[in-house]
Amino acid sequence: LPKAPVITTPLETVDALVEEVATFMCAVESYPQPEISWTRNKILIKLFDTRYSIRENGQLLTILSVEDSDDGIYCCTANNGVGGAVESCGALQVKMKPKITRPPINVKIIEGLKAVLPCTTMGNPKPSVSWIKGDSPLRENSRIAVLESGSLRIHNVQKEDAGQYRCVAKNSLGTAYSKVVKLEVEVFARILRAPESHNVTFGSFVTLHCTATGIPVPTITWIENGNAVSSGSIQESVKDRVIDSRLQLFITKPGLYTCIATNKHGEKFSTAKAAATISIAEWSKPQKDNKGYCAQYRGEVCNAVLAKDALVFLNTSYADPEEAQELLVHTAWNELKVVSPVCRPAAEALLCNHIFQECSPGVVPTPIPICREYCLAVKELFCAKEWLVMEEKTHRGLYRSEMHLLSVPECSKLPSMHWDPTACARLPHLDYNKENLKTFPPMTSSKPSVDIPNLPSSSSSSFSVSPTYSMT
């Protein structure tokens, strides 16, 4: 007698490993013999699909080599024209041993930055990821964390974080290890011991000592008055990432000696500097007043700023006033390379006129200080931001020598033009090149109508009350 199909063994959930065989059985009783079709996620499996084998009149579906994409709901449907079609469904869960799909790579990082070592994994059940540093499991802390993705994140990298790392992916089916990678921590060059200033007699031997560290170990070079050291012997030693350099000098003139420690980080360099002055005791020019004398300026640094053949005051408290004052300007001038184009010409004029003050000749040559109002104009109009930074550095003792203190006058201690117009020096007009100086820093929102031929004149930002007394 005709009999409608009945599925006697309903489909069950099947667990299978990748690359293994998985079989679903759909036993059917019916008369006449039914037609059995199979679907995966409601999509018909074609009889000629070579990834599958369908046997026993369609009652057995075999996946010949399971892939992780085969997971899903499989259904068999039986129909023989008697009664309705019947269906049974079961799930295929593809189990997978851990696999590291994005392994970590060697990393070079600068101390203090953030490092991320990738470790992306696959597997079912989802693998847990841990890390090994050297031979020991890595412990997480406030700086070191294993992210959800499995990657290792290290905040504020320290020297001690350097070493060999590997990630470990683990689930119930097995464990996978990445290859070992190296985390190298680089450290900016830093001076541990700065050379000390000396006041010595003519013809003395002096040894300047400079110690620096960094990763990689820095090199040390010595600069004398802005140029590479031309005389003297240098001895160096390296121990435990610390380089020690000693410069031995035979002193015949005063000078400014700078120790420069440099190391390389990829394409970039880091540099640390420290300077010392060598002055010569009891070494004054004969037949000069003991405070100073007037002479024409013969230096280079202030050539463009001081009037041609300007008579300047040379201070005999220095062993060699011309050279010492030129060094002072030179040192401070180098600091000005980083200031804004608005500030620089004003600061240069102030600096040169302050260190090489106008000289009033007479029985007692007298320096003529800059007028207070010109100093204030430079401080508050042209160089407001830079001045604040410089003063802060001075208070915090970031300047090693007194040079910067000497370089920048204290405006309030200078004479006012109101007191005696001849007792103080005016700074020359500051010319601004329209091409070089595109904007004058706008420090307020006010925009007065100002017609300034020597300054750029865009309507919005070129001169909105700038250089300005309004510093916001």
Epitope: H429, D451, S466
Partner: antibody, heavy 124, light 107 residues
Framework: EVQLVESGGGLVQPGGSLRLSCAAS????????IHWVRQAPGKGLEWVAS????????SYADSVKGRFTISADTSKNTAYLQMNSLRAEDTAVYYC?????????????????WGQGTLVTVSS | DIQMTQSPSSLSASVGDRVTITCRAS??????VAWYQQKPGKAPKLLIY???SLYSGVPSRFSGSRSGTDFTLTISSLQPEDFATYYC?????????FGQGTKVEIK
């Protein structure tokens, strides 16, 4: 002795024009900054305009911008204020004052010398 | 624009009193602040320049000081000739503004 003498004030109808002069002696206009400051009857001081001859630069208060023009003739050591499109609210005593130095330092010097003032009345 | 708010607008004091007048700038300004004295029918006279410098010929009882955006004129011991109106003034390059004035009257 430093002196500033204003002239050119008077009665003018709204929309009319006047030119004020400020004759300086005892100093050179070219090395100083000259300012015009006005004071409406019973009111406070209001800055009008400034000029620094050494820079040839000028500046104006918003209330007069486009209507007033400040200038200086260094050969005559005199500064001027050309006032056009006058309004009733421009009625005031107009003072000229000087501050020593160019545009950058003059603010620190204060206006140390003032003229006696000249009255401008704008009325129909 | 920078506003200079002067206070008080008027005050009554006796000879010998210590008098303080304050000007507050609406935003940070430099030390280019001056103080003037004006008597009725006369031009103003400069007393203090650069916030705290005493102009020549001005009695030492007048002094100026600064604290941030606050500028102060102090008369240490008021004299009969000091009864007048006082103005503060700040200078930009150039954007000049005056305070509204403080009238010092006899009590």
């Amino acid at each position: 002795e430093v002196q500033l003498v204003e002239s050119g004030g008077g009665l003018v109808q709204p929309g009319g024009s006047l030119r004020l002069s400020c004759a300086a002696s005892g100093f050179t206009v070219s090395s100083s900054s000259i300012h015009w400051v006005r004071q409406a009857p019973g009111k406070g001081l209001e800055w009008v305009a400034s000029i620094s001859s050494s820079y040839g630069s000028t500046s104006y208060a918003d209330s007069v911008k486009g209507r007033f023009t400040i200038s200086a003739d260094t050969s005559k050591n005199t500064a001027y204020l050309q006032m056009n499109s006058l309004r009733a609210e421009d009625t005031a005593v107009y003072y000229c004052a000087r501050s020593e130095g160019d545009r950058y330092v003059s603010g620190y010097m204060g206006m140390d010398y003032w003229g006696q003032g000249t009255l401008v009345t704008v009325s129909s | 624009d920078i506003q200079m708010t002067q206070s008080p607008s008027s005050l009554s004091a006796s000879v010998g009193d210590r008098v303080t007048i304050t000007c507050r700038a609406s935003q940070s300004v430099s030390s280019a602040v001056a103080w003037y004295q004006q008597k009725p029918g006369k031009a103003p006279k400069l007393l203090i320049y650069s916030a705290s410098s005493l102009y020549s010929g001005v009695p030492s009882r007048f002094s100026g000081s600064r604290s941030g955006t606050d500028f102060t004129l102090t008369i240490s011991s008021l004299q009969p000739e000091d009864f007048a109106t006082y103005y503060c003034q700040q200078s930009g390059v150039w954007l000049i503004t005056f305070g509204q004035g403080t009238k010092v009257e006899i009590k």
